[in-house]
Interface confidence: low
Amino acid sequence: DSSKWVFEHPETLYAWEGACVWIPCTYRALDGDLESFILFHNPEYNKNTSKFDGTRLYESTKDGKVPSEQKRVQFLGDKNKNCTLSIHPVHLNDSGQLGLRMESKTEKWMERIHLNVSERPFPPHIQLPPEIQESQEVTLTCLLNFSCYGYPIQLQWLLEGVPMRQAAVTSTSLTIKSVFTRSELKFSPQWSHHGKIVTCQLQDADGKFLSNDTVQLNVKHTPKLEIKVTPSDAIVREGDSVTMTCEVSSSNPEYTTVSWLKDGTSLKKQNTFTLNLREVTKDQSGKYCCQVSNDVGPGRSEEVFLQVQYAPEPSTVQILHSPAVEGSQVEFLCMSLANPLPTNYTWYHNGKEMQGRTEEKVHIPKILPWHAGTYSCVAENILGTGQRGPGAELDVQYPPKKVTTVIQNPMPIREGDTVTLSCNYNSSNPSVTRYEWKPHGAWEEPSLGVLKIQNVGWDNTTIACAACNSWCSWASPVALNVQYAPRDVRVRKIKPLSEIHSGNSVSLQCDFSSSHPKEVQFFWEKNGRLLGKESQLNFDSISPEDAGSYSCWVNNSIGQTASKAWTLEVLYAPRRLRVSMSPGDQVMEGKSATLTCESDANPPVSHYTWFDWNNQSLPYHSQKLRLEPVKVQHSGAYWCQGTNSVGKGRSPLSTLTVYYSPETIGRR
C-alpha cells in the first residue's frame, strides 16, 4: 500500500568466508530525505522499547557516531534512492538476516536482506543441453551465484583435467535483480568425447583453485566401425574365398542394424558382422564397407577394396591424337582391364612387333609419314597374357612432298608460243585440293594442276607452282628460257661526238638491248641498198653525198629486227655557186634584171655578198640582186659569195649585157 517504502535488491546473497558481499539496492522513501540509517545483523523488534535489538554493523546518525565495524561494512548509498552496501571481507558469522533501518523526518522502515556465507567457496553449477550429438555445436554454461567488486574470480573449463582450447565467454551480473558470474563455452563434441569428464573450476584472481563442478558428457553418435579382411591385403584370384569382419568400436545409443555395401549399394541378405564371399569372381571386385545404424543414424566403416585378380582382357589402343600432323608428337595408350595392372606390354605396328616398347604408353616425339598405320598391343600381368585387340589407325597428315613444275612444251619456247606447265608431286595427305602459281598472271588453268600461258612473253623468265592440301608446298622455280628476236634495235653515232662535217671520219653503231639466242648478224642499209654486215658502219672521209636515211637490221635464228631510219646529215661550206640571170644575160635598158646566187650548202647559206667586175662588193646581201631599171652602165661581169656556219664559197663570173633601147638609138 501507499504507506510502504519501496525497495529493490536481490532477495538472498551468497558468499564464503574471506570473500566479500556487494549488495545492489535502491529505495524510495515515503517523505523527504533519509535522516538516519542503521544496518542490523539479525534484528528483532522489542515491543517493550518499540525499538529493534541486534548487532549494529553500520550506523549513520545525525550526531555522526560510527562503530568500528564501519571499516568492514560500507553504506554506498545516498539520502533518497541508493541503498547499496558492501561487506569486505565477509565472515561465516555474517550469515543470517541483514536489516536496513531507515528513518526520514516523519517515517521509519526496516528492510530485510538474506545473507548466506559458507565456510568454503561453494561450487559453480554446470548446465548442459538436454541432448548432445557429435559434431553439433552446443553451449556449456557454468553458473556461480556470486560476484563482488572487491573479490575477483575466474571460471575455467577442463576436459579430462586438461584446459579446453575453445574460448569461453565470461559475464557477471551485479544488479538489483541478480548477482552471478557465468561462463559460456561453445563446443563441437566428437564421438570420442563420449563419457569424458568436463569440469568448471572456480579460481581466484591468482588462478588458485577454490571449487569446481563436473559432468560426464553423453555424446550421442553413430556407430564407429573397424573393418577387417582375410586375406589382409584383400587381393585374391577368381575362385578364392574372402571374409570381412565388422567391429563396432563405439556406439551411443546401442546399434540396431548391420548391413554390408559394395560400391555404395546394399548387399541383400547380409545382416551379420561377418561377410563371407566364396568362390569370388572378378565382378565382385569393388569397395566394400559395413554399415551399422543406431537411433542417431548410420555409421560406415572405411572401405576395403577387394581386388579379384585376372589375366588381361583383349586390349584396345587409344591414340592422342589422330589424324596427326607430321612433326607433331603422338601418344598411344594400351588399355586392357586386368588385375593386377599389366606389367609388360607388346606393341605392334601394322602387325609387326615394335622393338623395345614395353610400357603402357608409347610416345613418338616427332611423327613422320611412315608412322601411319594400325597400332595394336598385348598386355601381360602375373596371371597371363591378354589377346591383341583390333588396334587403332594412325593417320599422319603432311604437306605435299617433292613438288615439281614441269614444262610440257617441246623446247625451245619461242616468244608468242602457248606454253603448258603441270604441277606434279610425289605424295600428299590429305589429297591435294588446289594449286598456286607464281608469278600471278591472267593465265588459264584448263584443269587442276595445269597452267596454260597463251602468247608467252619474251620476259617470262621463271614459273613456280605449289600443291596445296591443308598446307602448300612450293616447287623450285623452273626457267622458261623463252627465245625471241633481237629487241630495241637502234642506230647510234659513235664518232664524231659533235656534228658531222664533210671530210670527217664517221662511225655508226648498230645497238640492241637483248637477244635469245645471243648469236646475231647485222645488216646496214641506205635507200634499200645493202652497205655492210658488221655492227659498225665506218666512213673514213664523209662527203655530202653520204648524207641520207640509214637503217640497221639485227638477225638471230628466231627473227630479224630493224632499227628506225636514222638520218645522216653532213655539214659543208657553200659549193657549186653560180650567178643566174633573169630574164637572161642580155637585157634592154629600162627593163628589170634579176641576178640570183645559186649554191649547194648545209646548212643553207646565211649571208650573201655580191661583187662587180672590179671585185667591188655591192651593198646587197640577199640571194637575189634586182636591177630596175637596168642601165647600160650595169653591163659587166658579176660574181657572188655565199657564207654559212661551215665556211664560204664563190661563184665564177657571169656577164650581164645591157643594150640600148630603140628609143635611145633613135635619139642618137
Epitope: A234, E302, V304
Partner: nanobody, 125 residues
Framework: QVQLVESGGGLVQAGGSLRLACAAS????????MGWFRQAPGKEREFVGA????????DHADSVKGRFTISRDDAQNTVFLHMNDLKPEDTAVYYC??????????????????WGQGTQVTVSS
Amino acid sequence: QVQLVESGGGLVQAGGSLRLACAASGDTVSIYYMGWFRQAPGKEREFVGALSASGQFTDHADSVKGRFTISRDDAQNTVFLHMNDLKPEDTAVYYCAVQRYGWVYRTDKTMYNYWGQGTQVTVSS
C-alpha cells in the same frame, strides 16, 4: 595415378619440432589411407603413422606415440606429420605413401601403392 611430394624436412636440434607436409595430386579420389614411413641409413623402412581418408582413424608407431601426430587439409589434398620433442634417433628420410584400396593393415609398407621421393630430417644432439 597418384603423385606425392613431401616437404618440410631439415636440420633441427634435439627437443625441437618440425612439420612435414605431403601434397597429393592426380587420382586423389581413390586414396584410402595416407601413411608416413621413415628409413634411417642402413635400416629397413619403418612405419611411423597413418590417417584414414575420412580422418576417423589414426595409427602411430609406439616409438613416436605422444610426440608425433598426423592431420590433414582436405581442401589442399595434403597430410601433415607434426613432430615434437625430436630425438637424434628420429634422423631418417621420411616418406609419404598412399594406399589406394583401404586395407585395414596400415602398418605394412607392402600395402602402399604410391610413394613420395622422401624428405631428409636430421636431429642433432
